[in-house]
Amino acid sequence: IVLRPSRVHNSEENTMRALTLKDILNGTFSYKTFFPNWISGQEYLHQSADNNIVLYNIETGQSYTILSNRTMKSVNASNYGLSPDRQFVYLESDYSKLWRYSYTATYYIYDLSNGEFVRGNELPRPIQYLCWSPVGSKLAYVYQNNIYLKQRPGDPPFQITFNGRENKIFNGIPDWVYEEEMLATKYALWWSPNGKFLAYAEFNDTDIPVIAYSYYGDEQYPRTINIPYPKAGAKNPVVRIFIIDTTYPAYVGPQEVPVPAMIASSDYYFSWLTWVTDERVCLQWLKRVQNVSVLSICDFREDWQTWDCPKTQEHIEESRTGWAGGFFVSTPVFSYDAISYYKIFSDKDGYKHIHYIKDTVENAIQITSGKWEAINIFRVTQDSLFYSSNEFEEYPGRRNIYRISIGSYPPSKKCVTCHLRKERCQYYTASFSDYAKYYALVCYGPGIPISTLHDGRTDQEIKILEENKELENALKNIQLPKEEIKKLEVDEITLWYKMILPPQFDRSKKYPLLIQVYGGPCSQSVRSVFAVNWISYLASKEGMVIALVDGRGTAFQGDKLLYAVYRKLGVYEVEDQITAVRKFIEMGFIDEKRIAIWGWSYGGYVSSLALASGTGLFKCGIAVAPVSSWEYYASVYTERFMGLPTKDDNLEHYKNSTVMARAEYFRNVDYLLIHGTADDNVHFQNSAQIAKALVNAQVDFQAMWYSDQNHGLSGLSTNHLYTHMTHFLKQCFSLSD
């Protein structure tokens, strides 16, 4: 149980105040984290409060400014990057967001040796991606879907690709679906460790159907946005991987890396690239039916100037109970011998654990085991492996950092974070310097977040980097809700839930209940993290009980729970929310006439289906930017969990799992449907179809659209959205304004 103290004592009650909606919308109680920008084993850069770029040396204890805020301001820079040889800094300005990760920007190169911007052969604008080589100061960048290389910032560029074309051929950057659903990055190029080679992906979207929607803007006629976007079952991008020698780029030009035969025999994806050495690279491929993944280790053949991927260096990962991996297929972390590696995948008991692969996957040595999951491998050094897991005290929604000594036999395991600040910190991530000489720990809660610096050998805390003192002080007179994390055992399924309770919660009273749901495959909502957000306000000021429940399909509790939804989205996720609500009613403090559910994206889909379940449990609910039919969503994501929408595969469940099919069942609930018209991710089409089905069934409902807003509904739309949803819920629960 995690109780967030509300610090209310009768004597001070009059000085305490509840959270307001304004607090939330203004971000009054937001927190800061500190991630060092590591530049060596013992040095990092950080942008100071006054925008100077400061270098910190942990060992000398010294810090100094390398770039003044005046220089930053001279080009309106919002970001920077130091070249590995420490001679230059790129300054990024004119940031223009594209999709989730991608953006374009203008780049200026500043020469630290002479304190001037590099003149001559300036970079074109806007650039889609730019990065330094890992050694020296070579530059690779993508402009108008083509890749360019500069040996030095002042040199003329060498053009590597020539076939780049908007919405057709993408070089070094992903197309929409690869960015959102496969790579989760804005880039698709990778330098070899010493900068000798540059690998890149080419995505051919020529045959992909295009989603088109209006962008209204301010002009007389709206613009049409066109995005090659493969929906379930549609034609997918064709991917190829090339590698070029950056020392002599014109000598043989880009060399294509061969695709494993068992992958190339049908539609496939490229999932990630990991350099091992300058002359060894590891590529991961995935069949379109995403239960078979192949990891292929390729070597440079000097004599032929080509890349060879022997079958003996192909490692197959297959799932017989679901899809390969968790959300993504995990990536390998290579050891110092440059051939063996550590990787997270399911063990024989169906829990994701770290395995050591030396020759074949069949002979993998299991490094961690238990009825919990290893979540991320942070770093492997010669004697230690650092990873995160949710093992400690059997709370799946926690993250602690562990060190396994791999230099000694038998390997010993130590939890680095479990007992550091046990009440305050139960959910960590980490950032390591070169050779793990030092590392930063960032604790996200359940208490106020704190970032600390540690010695990589002894794990000793060196200093606090950020402790959010101002936030702590600001919260001193706020009546925060109480939070508890517990579990329900129902029909051999464990349902973890987080309950957010009003500050003066009294079990003998009855409270309205709001379920907040996401529920997507491999997601987790019940986490031991700090947040002061909209639901905190609803509990603190409006006296609601809010619950989040992780049902079947959610992550980090084993494959049985995770893969339960395979090929059957929209069934068990909904059932488990309903089951939890029934259990909450049994607890005795829920007013069963005032129960609501809301969710965004996948959560909007689940909340819609829950409202239309015909149980009579919910009085009202909200769906923000919901998926309404899996035929409308992206191929890579949808097919991972649902297979193909074809008669001989899974078309029947595609049809049965739509929100529209349940239009009739919305008759007895109050439904608020919300969507942005410029949603590139979950297209407005989804809500348009729900609305059409409800109208055709003559079912009354409420709706709100946000013109020209995407899936995030940001800016002023956020304020309008939460104000609107608050009014809706208060009306539903008969709470006075």
Epitope: E43, G61, Q62, S68, R86
Partner: nanobody, 115 residues
Framework: QVQLQESGGGLVQAGGSLRLSCAAS????????MGWYRQAPGKRREWVAT???????NYADSVKARFTISRDNSKNTVYLQMNSLKPEDTAVYYC?????????WGQGTQVTVSS
């Protein structure tokens, strides 16, 4: 206030050698990554060599195999051993941290290589 004092420059014949020294004071620790830089007449200042906190070295292509950067932590001093000097090495040589401390350059030491 950080002070970096360069010394050891002079006039030398082509093919000759010089050893430059840089003493750090004002609380500055030469175990920080340090670099040598130079500015030839009518040109912009350029980077010459770097020694990182953990002792790794890096050189500009124009001086590779001729110049050697080193440090003596007990003396808080960084050195640049320059061999096989060429007329094009003629410049004022400066030392600084790597990357350089913003707005903190010393007087430098003049190196002139005659042919």
């Amino acid at each position: 206030q950080v002070q970096l004092q360069e010394s050891g420059g002079g006039l030398v014949q082509a093919g000759g050698s010089l050893r430059l020294s840089c003493a750090a004071s004002g609380g500055f620790d030469s175990r920080n990554a340090m670099g040598w830089y130079r500015q030839a007449p009518g040109k912009r200042r350029e980077w010459v060599a770097t020694i990182t906190s953990d002792g790794r070295t890096n050189y500009a292509d124009s001086v590779k195999a001729r110049f050697t950067i080193s440090r003596d932590n007990s003396k808080n001093t960084v050195y640049l051993q320059m061999n096989s000097l060429k007329p094009e090495d003629t410049a004022v040589y400066y030392c600084n941290a790597a990357p350089p401390i913003f707005g903190s350059w010393g007087q430098g030491t003049q190196v002139t290589v005659s042919s």
